[in-house]
Every structure is written in structure tokens, then in C-alpha cells.
Interface confidence: low
């Protein structure tokens, strides 16, 4: 496990190979979660920001950028899209949360909440995932598509097994997140595959 505070993964080129596997011991299904991270890219085409697949289940949990101003969240292969007015290109801090009991999904961009959406009420996100940054999985840990690959920088990634209250979302945005128990940038277990470089975070 590595403390990546003040660092980012740089994905320098479009590819079908370059990615980072995030390793977690998630042993029970998720009925709530919050995921936060920072990203910086000048891509205008669609791309995957966070891809979580389980055995035999594609798009179990995906954060996907459709186009400038449109972010999508997939839970169990269902999708909702969030709209935001944003500068391009510009660094962004993204938090997304989902609560199974209500189905409510929340998206926060740079500490500001977007209009809430609903999907997959009562569903449980399966455990034992393959989590990939830099590519969109179409199978369990593989089947990548160059046209959906991420080119840019990702850092400060945290994932909790709960829906964080607004003040904790803001803490994450401000760089002081509460401890995260699924993925924690300060104690991250990861595996770099291909051309991905760790560099200092210089754009926050």
C-alpha cells in the first residue's frame, strides 16, 4: 500500500493497454457508496473515469464522461446522466454517491451538488470487483476500447461504503477527506499496466 498524497497517475496517451488496477478487499455487496477523485484532461470525446466490474457483470459501477458538461453514472448497467456548466479544459473534483434504499445518486463537481437522480433502488453493487482507471472494462478486468480510454491525470481518489454528508464531500474537495475504507489515496494498493506514470499533483 502506497501513500500517493500530492501525486497523480498520468495517462499520457490514447491506448487500449494503459491502465491502473485498483486493488481492494471488498468482500460484501455495496448498498451505499461515495467515490471522490480529481481529474484533469483535455479530451472532448467520451471516456471512462472509473470502471468497476464484477465477474460476469459489465458496467456494475462506472463513472463516464459523455461530453463536456455531461457525466454519467452506471449502477448495475443502468445509467443516469448529470449536467453541469463547466470550463474546458479545466481540473475537476468529482464526488458521486449512491444509496440503494432510495436509489438516489448525487454528483458533486468542485464542491457543488448537481441535480439528484435516481436509479436501481434496492439494488446491491456486487463485491469482489476489478477496478480500473484509464480504460473502460467490457469484461472482468479487460476488453478495453481505445475510443473510451482516458488521457490525462487522476488523483486524490477515495471510496467509502457510505453516503458522505455534504460537509464531508466538501472536506474531500478541500483536500482533507475523512478516512476511506474501500479505496484510500493515502494507502492505495494498485498495479500499473502499460504507460502510466506517477507525477506530482501541480494543478490544485
Amino acid at each position: 500500500h502506497t501513500d500517493l498524497s500530492g501525486k497523480v497517475f498520468v495517462f499520457p496517451r490514447e491506448s487500449v493497454t494503459d491502465h491502473v488496477n485498483l486493488i481492494t478487499q471488498l468482500e460484501k455487496p455495496l448498498q451505499n457508496f461515495t467515490l471522490c477523485f480529481r481529474a484533469y484532461t483535455d479530451l472532448s470525446r467520451p471516456y471512462s473515469l472509473f470502471s468497476y466490474n464484477t465477474q460476469g457483470k459489465d458496467n456494475e459501477l462506472v463513472v463516464y464522461k459523455e461530453r463536456v458538461g455531461d457525466y454519467s453514472l452506471y449502477i448495475g448497467r443502468q445509467k443516469v446522466t448529470f449536467k453541469v456548466i463547466e470550463k474546458f479544459p479545466a481540473p475537476v473534483h468529482i464526488c458521486v454517491s449512491w444509496e440503494s434504499s432510495s436509489g438516489i445518486a448525487e454528483f458533486w463537481i468542485n464542491g457543488t451538488p448537481l441535480v439528484k437522480k435516481g436509479l436501481r433502488q434496492g439494488y446491491s453493487v456486487e463485491a469482489h470487483p476489478k477496478i480500473v482507471l484509464g480504460q473502460e472494462q467490457d469484461s472482468y478486468g479487460g476488453k478495453f476500447d481505445k475510443s473510451q480510454s482516458f488521457v490525462g491525470e487522476i488523483g486524490d481518489l477515495y471510496m467509502w461504503n457510505s453516503v458522505l454528508p455534504p460537509e464531508e464531500i466538501l472536506s474531500a474537495y478541500q483536500g482533507t477527506p475523512v478516512p476511506a475504507n474501500i479505496l484510500d489515496w493515502r494507502a492505495l494498493n494498485y498495479e500499473i499496466k502499460g504507460y502510466v506514470i506517477i507525477k506530482p499533483l501541480v494543478w490544485v
Epitope: 501513500d3 493515502r186 494507502a187
Partner: antibody, heavy 119, light 107 residues
Framework: QVQLVQSGAEVKKPGSSVKVSCKAS????????MHWVRQAPGQGLEWIGM????????NYNEKFKSRATLTVDKSTSTAYMELSSLRSEDTAVYYC????????????WGQGTLVTVSS | DIQMTQSPSSLSASVGDRVTITCKAS??????VAWYQQKPGKAPKALIY???YRYSGVPSRFSGSGSGTDFTLTISSLQPEDFATYYC?????????FGQGTKLEIK
């Protein structure tokens, strides 16, 4: 096996400093957060702070921020906790504890170091 | 800081008894609670993490439950070696905080 071995008991004067060591063995020292917790005689447990040996990133309990300093020596797999401006209420057993590699709890503890502050 | 209030502060019980210790957090801590056992002159030992998961090697008579603000440690059938002090700990927010402890004594 995984072990944390702490330095021996200390008797200190009020106003002085103490530095407690914690030597890790049986695991990769630089991969786990190290925490420090204290326990006054007959009292409960109090979290002081934590340090990641790889980056030397720290996080302190606000109560101790001005007086506690956490450091590591990677070459000897040893963590240190220094507490300055000691007062009688700092008399306690000081523990180092390793954070589990996934969940935020302490899975391995040192045996404790008794620090007595007395004039 | 989040306060963790344990009850009772002390408890007398007999071998074979079922014992329940509760811990109440002053605000939501999700399932980020651990339980430790401490014997006199010794360091604490992890029993339960993430509210309900037993640490490796911990006997099955120990179980944990709860989420949000209310948590419980249950010992289904007390054994002689279980007489000790038990602490809950929240690890949801900095600073991490502990309950004041529950001393379990032989009746």
C-alpha cells in the same frame, strides 16, 4: 511474525521532552500507517496521531498537534513519537499500533511504554 | 470530536452468560467502528472491525453489530479468559476516538 517492539519506560521532569521508539518487524514497514495511542493510568485510550512511513505524511489529533512529533527511520523500520513540554497529566502508557491494510482499525500493537512525568 | 459513549461502564457476569456492551456515537460514523479487548498490563487486541467483522483468530462467540450511531458487542457465552476491559473506537472521522471502556468482571 508481525511485531512492534517499543522502547523502555521513562521518567521525565515537567517541561522536558520524551521520545518513544517503536521497531517494526515481520512486515513491510513502509506499506502501513503507524498510529500512536496513549492511556493514562486507570483511564481509556486516546489517539495521538498517525504517520505513513513511505511518504512521512502525518495526521495529528488537534489536542497534540503543537507538542507531538511523529517521525520514522525507514532504514531501521522504526517509528518515533516525541512529546514536548511534558506535564504531569502526560503520565501514561504510550502505544504504537499498525493500521490494518484495508480497514481503519489497529491490528497490531506494541507492548506499550510507560512515561512518568514527575518533579 | 465524535464522542463514543459506552455502557455499562462495568459489568459483573458469570461463565456461560450472554453479555452485551453498547456504544453510542455522538454523530453518524457509518459502520466504521472497531472493538478491542484489553487485559491489565497488556496492549489492546482487535476483536471486531467494520462494526461486524471478526478479526482473524477471534472466537465466534464474539460478534458485533450496528451502523450509524448505535453499536453492540455481544459475547454469546462467557469464558474465563473473556474477563477484561472492552473499548469501542470510531474510525470514521479525525481524530479517531474511543469509548471510555467497559470492565467485565467475574460475578
Amino acid at each position: 511474525q508481525v511485531q512492534l517492539v517499543q522502547s523502555g519506560a521513562e521518567v521525565k521532569k515537567p517541561g522536558s521532552s520524551v521520545k518513544v521508539s517503536c521497531k517494526a518487524s515481520g512486515y513491510t514497514f513502509t506499506s502501513y500507517w503507524m498510529h500512536w495511542v496513549r492511556q493514562a493510568p486507570g483511564q481509556g485510550l486516546e489517539w495521538i496521531g498517525m504517520i505513513h512511513p513511505n511518504s512521512v505524511n502525518t495526521n495529528y489529533n488537534e489536542k497534540f498537534k503543537s507538542r507531538a512529533t511523529l517521525t520514522v527511520d525507514k532504514s531501521t523500520s522504526t517509528a518515533y513519537m516525541e512529546l514536548s513540554s511534558l506535564r504531569s497529566e502526560d503520565t501514561a502508557v504510550y502505544y504504537c499500533a499498525r493500521r490494518n491494510d484495508y480497514y481503519w482499525y489497529f491490528d497490531v500493537w506494541g507492548q506499550g511504554t510507560l512515561v512518568t512525568v514527575s518533579s | 470530536d465524535i464522542q463514543m459513549t459506552q455502557s455499562p461502564s462495568s459489568l459483573s457476569a458469570s461463565v456461560g452468560d450472554r453479555v452485551t456492551i453498547t456504544c453510542k456515537a455522538s454523530q453518524n460514523v457509518n459502520s466504521n467502528v472497531a472493538w478491542y479487548q484489553q487485559k491489565p498490563g497488556k496492549a489492546p487486541k482487535a476483536l471486531i472491525y467494520s462494526a461486524s467483522y471478526r478479526y482473524s483468530g477471534v472466537p465466534s462467540r464474539f460478534s458485533g453489530s450496528g451502523s450509524g450511531t448505535d453499536f453492540t458487542l455481544t459475547i454469546s457465552s462467557l469464558q474465563p479468559e473473556d474477563f477484561a476491559t472492552y473499548y469501542c473506537q470510531q474510525c470514521n472521522n479525525y481524530p479517531f476516538t474511543f469509548g471510555q471502556g467497559t470492565k467485565l468482571e467475574i460475578k
